[in-house]
Each structure stands twice: as C-alpha cells, then as structure tokens.
C-alpha cells in the first residue's frame, strides 16, 4: 500500500509462493533455501523465482517445487510469535542477475534505518486490489517502544515494526513471508498488522536476526553431503 512498481527484477531474492495461486512471498537466502513466514506454511508449495509480473510468463522465471518445508518449532499460530519457516528447493535455483540470494543479518534492526519491503499483496488499505507486478516500498525501522505502543501486549522480542505511524504506506495481505531488507541484509519477514497502512498501526515483522542460528542449523541438518572415500 502506498508503494511503487519495482524496477523489473530489481529484487532478485524475492520469490512468490504458489499453491495454485500466489498466497505468500519469500526470500531466497541460498541457491537451495528460501525463508518465509511460519503462517505461510502449506504442505505443498511451488516456489516461483525471477518473477515480476506473476500473471505473465516473461522468460526469467524459475518454478521449483518445495522439497522440505520446515516451520519454526516454537511457531505460535495465535500470537504469530516465531513466524518463520524455511523451504528447501527440490533443485538448486540458477543464480543470475535476476535470481540471487540475500544475506542474513549480522546485527539486529536499528530504529531509523531505511528498508525495502516488497511483495504482490493488496495495494489498498480500504478495499482490495491485488497487483500483477511486484510492488516496492521504502520504509524506516521503528523503535521497539513505538512498536509496542502501537500494539500493547502483542509485540514479542521476535517482532519489530517498520513503516509510518501516520499511515498510508504498509505491507498488506499477500505480502506475508516477503522481505524487509536493510543495507543488503534480510532484517525482516512480513508478518502481521491491524489492517494495512492505518494510522498508528505499522506493519509487524519477524526479526530475522533472532533466527540466524536456527536457520544455519536447520540448513546444515537438512543438507546431504556425499563423502567419497
């Protein structure tokens, strides 16, 4: 909501999760792994990489089925705490200028830092308009105090807010699982919010920094290394 059409393939780590229709976004973090939101879990997912217009085959797409879908063991479907999942692709993505991985964070998100949010979610705060072309939004990370004041009792240490307290610009339904990137690092995963782009109701995002060890450990535990003797 309140964003702009991204330059084509300018967000090469952005993926669309498809189950017959686009239902969530995600981020490519290595040639064979995607990170998304825990509440985007489905038993069968096709990961669509290199997408810009999700309704048109433009020639840069890679459609790869999920081989493993691993939701965080402490994901809470009622509070959306630990709202993160990992998808292992059934075959590695072909990395090129239009499909490439985003780095995991080396430090937690800092208030005031500019970030890029992207997705194919609803672009209207009142009504519904689902775009075909990838939308981008530049938005600042808010302080934890501002975040908690916006949602008293709802914000855990695994969440942070990004956006504008005055409203007007935000992620929305269909953006979940997608990236929040600051300084070339995946800081957030689109998670939830009361409405979209409402005053004093900024978007709430999963704090990826808290899960770097889990991500690395999970990838290691689910990677098959062949040892030749």
């Amino acid at each position: 909501v309140g964003g702009y059409i991204c330059e084509e393939n300018s967000v090469p780590y952005q993926v669309s999760l498809n189950s017959g229709y686009h239902f969530c976004g995600g981020s490519l973090i290595s040639e064979q792994w995607v990170v998304s939101a825990g509440h985007c879990y489905k038993s069968r997912i096709q990961v669509r990489l290199g997408e810009h217009n999700i309704e048109v085959l433009e020639g840069n797409e890679q459609f790869i089925n999920a081989a493993k879908i691993i939701r965080h063991p402490k994901y809470n479907s009622r509070t959306l705490d630990n709202d993160i999942l990992l998808i292992k692709l059934s075959s590695p993505a072909v990395i090129n200028s239009r499909v490439s991985a985003i780095s995991l964070p080396t430090a937690p998100p800092a208030a005031g830092t500019e970030s890029l949010i992207s997705g194919w979610g609803n672009t209207l705060s009142s009504g519904a308009d689902y775009p075909d072309e990838l939308q981008c939004l530049d938005a600042p990370v808010l302080s934890q105090a501002e975040c908690e004041a916006s949602y008293p009792g709802k914000i855990t240490n695994n969440m942070f807010c990004v956006g504008f307290l005055e409203g007007g610009k935000d992620s929305c339904q269909g953006d979940a699982g997608g990236p929040v990137v600051s300084n070339g690092e995946l800081q957030g995963i689109v998670s939830w919010g009361y409405g979209c782009a409402q005053k004093n109701r900024p978007g709430v995002y999963t704090k990826v920094y808290n899960y770097v060890d889990w991500i690395k450990d999970t990838i290691a535990a689910n990677s098959h290394h062949h040892h030749h003797h």
Partner: antibody, heavy 126, light 106 residues
Framework: QVQLQESGPGLVKPSETLSLTCTVS????????WHWIRQPAGKGLEWIGR???????FYNPSLKSRVTMSVDTSKNQFSLKLSSVTAADTAVYYC????????????????????WGQGTTVTVSS | DIQMTQSPSSLSASVGDRVTITCQAS??????LNWYQQKPGKAPKLLIY???NLETGVPSRFSGSGSGTDFTFTISSLQPEDIATYYC????????FGGGTKVEIK
C-alpha cells in the same frame, strides 16, 4: 468479551435477496476477519465467506455468484446479501469471528472461528 | 473443493468411555484442521485448532491429532455434558466442514 448478534428478516420470498447484519459488541471490528456460516435444519455447516475491514472478501466458490459482503466500521457491523434465494437457502445463519488473535496476518489463507453469534433463522417461502 | 469425510456419523457411548471420531480430507491439508462442538439449538464452539491445539477454557479430556489427510478427535472420558454433534473443519483452501458426528449417551 466480544459478542455477535445477527439481525434481519426471518422470511424472504423466493428470487429475492436475503440481507443480514452482524453487530459486534465488546470489541473492535477492525482487528479480525469476520465470517458468515449457515446450517439448514438438521444438516451440517456450510461456510459462506469472510470479510475484513479493508473490504477484501473471499466467498465459497459454490455461492460466489450470489454473495456480497460488506462492512461498516463506524457501526461495528458487517453484512451479508444473498441474491436470488430459493427454498434451499432456508437455514440458520451465523456470523463468527476469525480465531487468529490478529486476523491481520498478511498471507492469503484461511482460519477457523472462535466467537459465534447465536444464529438467526431465515426461511425462504412465498 | 476439499471434501471432509467424518466418521462415524453417530455413536452411542457410556459415561467414562473413550470416544474417537475421525476426519479424512480429500487432499493433504497439513495441520489446518479445527474441531467444533455444537449442542442442540446453539452455535458451534471451537474446541481444537490447528489439529491438536486446545482452545483456551476447553477441558483437557478433549484432544486432537493428525496431519496431512487423516485426523482424530478424542474425548478421553465421556461426560454427560459432552452430548453434542462434533464437526471437523479444514482451512487449507477456503473452508469446508465435515458432515458431523452425533454423540449420544448409552
């Protein structure tokens, strides 16, 4: 605690439009998805559709051509219209709240219902 | 459409008995399965969400399990107040309910 109350005509003529309203009290309508469900006498439950206050709706594919849902946040109400009714639409109609705390998770998916109205009986007859 | 097949359609058991109801989905729905209790003339009440999570305030004698296509709902020790019809509900793709299981006391 949140309470839901369905209201509307108990009798609708065939081919006309059934109109029902659900009033939400004890909480804000803007923090959840909201559903309509119906149940013919002695039969099972059928989901009609859901709405949230952005106006975004999802309808049961089998009823989609006849269903319209709307929301009035100023009155804390949401509504159902079902057009071209027949005797097969005779049922108890329930409104319900989505079970997720937030109702605003930003995926495109579905949940269940944790708070229900008591239901209102609608009979389609001439 | 995802079809939900519940069985049995009705059962009769004694107070204190263990009661089991099954629900089968026509395709894999992961754990997006809820269970409801409906007493005559009343609205349904959520008991179990996401296949196995007990809703707040619901007695611990109710439980759910399963994933994929096969799900089970159990009342560990049937009580007189448990007389009702129980419904499963999938939320993986739109929402559909099972046909219901009517539970009676012998």
């Amino acid at each position: 605690q949140v309470q839901l109350q369905e209201s509307g005509p108990g009798l609708v003529k065939p081919s006309e439009t059934l109109s029902l309203t659900c009033t939400v009290s004890g909480g804000s309508i803007s923090s959840h998805y909201w559903h309509w469900i119906r149940q013919p006498a002695g039969k099972g439950l059928e989901w009609i559709g859901r709405i949230h206050t952005s106006g975004s709706t999802f309808y049961n594919p089998s009823l989609k051509s006849r269903v319209t849902m709307s929301v009035d946040t100023s009155k804390n109400q949401f509504s159902l219209k079902l057009s071209s009714v027949t005797a097969a639409d005779t049922a108890v109609y329930y409104c319900a709240r989505d079970l997720t705390n937030y109702g605003w998770s930003k995926s495109i998916r579905f949940y269940g219902m944790d708070v229900w109205g008591q239901g209102t009986t609608v009979t389609v007859s001439s | 459409d995802i079809q939900m097949t519940q069985s049995p359609s009705s059962l009769s058991a004694s107070v204190g008995d263990r009661v089991t109801i099954t629900c089968q989905a026509s395709q894999d729905i992961s754990n997006y399965l809820n269970w409801y209790q409906q007493k005559p003339g009343k609205a349904p009440k959520l008991l179990i969400y996401d296949a196995s999570n007990l809703e707040t305030g619901v007695p611990s004698r109710f439980s759910g399990s399963g994933s994929g296509t096969d799900f089970t709902f159990t009342i560990s020790s049937l009580q007189p107040e448990d007389i009702a019809t129980y419904y499963c509900q999938q939320t993986d793709n739109f929402i559909t309910f099972g046909g219901g299981t009517k539970v009676e006391i012998k």
